[in-house]
C-alpha cells in the first residue's frame, strides 16, 4: 500500500504520500485554531506508471495505454486515497471547544 | 459539475474532463474485444486552481495552502469522479458473450 | 479591497424563511470567520452567529437557535444565512461582518446590510 | 448573557473639546475582549477600537480606548465635526457577543 507506513520510509519516485507540515496560522491564515499550532496533512505526488496502485478499471486502462503510446499526456494522477480527521481547539470567547475536522490528513495515496 | 456537458463545450484550461478515444486493437493490444472497436475512455487534465471542484477538506486546504504559499509543490490533481461502464461483445469459442466493465467512461472529474 | 455586498432588501410574510447571501472580496475569504448581526430600532445590535468557512463550523446565539441556519460556499466566496419561521419582531437590517479572525472577536469589515421586513 | 450599559446615551459637545463615553459589562471581560464602533446615519458601523485599546487601521489618533473588567472608556481627544455618529461598544469575550445600546453624539 502507499501509505506512510511503506513511502516515509523508502525513496519512492513513483506515486507515494509525502510529508507535509501546515501551520495554521502561517500557511492557511486560520487564526481562530488554537491547538495544534499546525499538522501533518501530507500530500500526494509521483508518477503513476501502469498498474501502480490503480484505483479503478478506467486507470489502468489510461495507464495501458499511456504505456503502449509514450507520447500521450493523458496518464493517471496520484491522489489522496485514506484520510482521517485531524481533532482541534478553539476558543468561542473565552470557551474552549473540541471540533473533529474530517478529511484532514493523507495516510495513503492511489493512482486514479 | 465538470462534466462532459460543461467540458466539451468550452475550451477550459483548468480541470475538465478531455475527450480520448481508445481503439481496443491499436492502442491496447486487446485483440478479444469484438464490439466496439473502440470507445471514448475520456480522462482528466488541468490545473486545479484554489477551490475548483474541490472532493475534500483536504484538498480544499491543499488548495488554500498553495494560494498562500505559491512556491509549494504540493498542489491537488485532477482526477475522475462520476465513471460510468462499457457494454462489450466478446467471443468464448464461437459462442458470443456480453459483458459489462465497470469504471470504463469519465464523465466527470474532480480536484482532489 | 475587502469588499463584502450583501442580497439587496426583502419581504417576507411571518412563518416564512428568508435566505441573504454575503459575496466577499478582496481577501482570503476561507481564512476569515463570518458574522451575522441584525439591526433594529428597538433592539439595537444584536449578533446572530457565526460560521467558518471551509470546515463549516457555525456558532450561533441561543435565541436564533433551531430557526437559523449560517452556510458558507467557499467555491463563490459567499456566505448565507437563513433564518426561518418569520415573525414580526424579525423586521431588521441584516449585516455581515468580517471577524479580526477568532471564532468571537471584533467585525473589522461589514456588508452594506439587507432590510428585511416581516408583514403579513 | 453579558449585559452592555453604555453612558451617557447622548451627548453634545464643540468641536476641539474632549469627549469619554463609559461601557459598563455584567461580568468581568478581562483586559481585551472589547470593541468600540462608530456608525453614522444610513451608513454601517466602523470598528475604531478592538482589545480594549487597539486602534483600528485608519483610525485616526485621536480616537483611543482603555479599561478592564467591567469597565471601559473611549476616549476623543479633541473633537472633529466629522465625529458626529453613534458609538456602540461590543464584548466578545463569552457568546453571545453583545453591543450596548449606544451613545449619541452631537456637535455643537
Known amino acids: 500500500a502507499l501509505d506512510t507506513n511503506y513511502c516515509f520510509r523508502n525513496l519512492e519516485e513513483n506515486c507515494c504520500v509525502r510529508p507535509l507540515y501546515i501551520d495554521f496560522r502561517q500557511d492557511l491564515g486560520w487564526k481562530w485554531v488554537h491547538e495544534p499550532k499546525g499538522y501533518y496533512a501530507n500530500f500526494c505526488s509521483g508518477p503513476c506508471p501502469y498498474l501502480r496502485s490503480a484505483d479503478t478499471t478506467h486507470s489502468t486502462v489510461l495507464g495501458l495505454y499511456n504505456t503502449l503510446n509514450p507520447e500521450a499526456s493523458a496518464s493517471p494522477c496520484c491522489v489522496p486515497q485514506d484520510l482521517e480527521p485531524l481533532t482541534i481547539l478553539y476558543y468561542v470567547g473565552r470557551t474552549p471547544k473540541v471540533e473533529q475536522l474530517s478529511n484532514m490528513v493523507v495516510k495513503s495515496c492511489k493512482c486514479s | 459539475a465538470l462534466d462532459t456537458n460543461y467540458c466539451f463545450r468550452n475550451l477550459e484550461e483548468n480541470c475538465c474532463v478531455r475527450p480520448l478515444y481508445i481503439d481496443f486493437r491499436q492502442d491496447l493490444g486487446w485483440k478479444w474485444v469484438h464490439e466496439p472497436k473502440g470507445y471514448y475512455a475520456n480522462f482528466c487534465s488541468g490545473p486545479c486552481p484554489y477551490l475548483r471542484s474541490a472532493d475534500t477538506t483536504h484538498s480544499t486546504v491543499l488548495g488554500l495552502y498553495n494560494t498562500l504559499n505559491p512556491e509549494a509543490s504540493a498542489s491537488p490533481c485532477c482526477v475522475p469522479q462520476d465513471l460510468e461502464p462499457l457494454t462489450i461483445l466478446y467471443y468464448v469459442g464461437r459462442t458470443p458473450k456480453v459483458e459489462q466493465l465497470s469504471n470504463m467512461v469519465v464523465k466527470s472529474c474532480k480536484c482532489s | 479591497q475587502v469588499l463584502l455586498v450583501q442580497s439587496g432588501a426583502d419581504v417576507r410574510k411571518p412563518g416564512a424563511s428568508v435566505k441573504i447571501f454575503c459575496k466577499a472580496s478582496g481577501y482570503t475569504f476561507s481564512s476569515n470567520v463570518m458574522h451575522w448581526v441584525r439591526q433594529t430600532p428597538a433592539q439595537g445590535f444584536e449578533w446572530m452567529g457565526s460560521v467558518i468557512p471551509i470546515v463549516d463550523i457555525a456558532t450561533y446565539a441561543r435565541r436564533f437557535q433551531g430557526r437559523l441556519v449560517l452556510t458558507a460556499d467557499t467555491s463563490t466566496n459567499t456566505a448565507y444565512m437563513e433564518l426561518r419561521s418569520l415573525k414580526s419582531a424579525d423586521t431588521a437590517v441584516y449585516y455581515c461582518?468580517?471577524?479580526?479572525?477568532?471564532?468571537?472577536?471584533?467585525?473589522?469589515?461589514w456588508g452594506q446590510g439587507s432590510l428585511v421586513t416581516v408583514s403579513s | 448573557e453579558i449585559q452592555m450599559t453604555q453612558s451617557p446615551s447622548s451627548l453634545s459637545a464643540s468641536p476641539g473639546d474632549r469627549v469619554t463615553i463609559t461601557c459598563r459589562a455584567s461580568?468581568?471581560?478581562?483586559?481585551?475582549?472589547l470593541a468600540w464602533y462608530q456608525q453614522k446615519p444610513g451608513k454601517v458601523p466602523k470598528l475604531l477600537i478592538y482589545g480594549a485599546s487597539s486602534r483600528a487601521p485608519g483610525v485616526p489618533s485621536r480616537f483611543s480606548g482603555s479599561g478592564s473588567g467591567t469597565d471601559f472608556t473611549l476616549t476623543i481627544s479633541s473633537l472633529e465635526p466629522e465625529d458626529a455618529a453613534t458609538y456602540y461598544c461590543?464584548?466578545?469575550?463569552?457568546?453571545?457577543?453583545?453591543f450596548g445600546q449606544g451613545t449619541k453624539l452631537e456637535i455643537k
Open positions: 461580568q468581568s471581560l478581562g483586559s481585551s475582549y
Open positions: 461582518a468580517r471577524t479580526l479572525g477568532l471564532v468571537l472577536d471584533a467585525m473589522d469589515y
Open positions: 461590543q464584548q466578545y469575550a463569552d457568546s453571545p457577543i453583545t
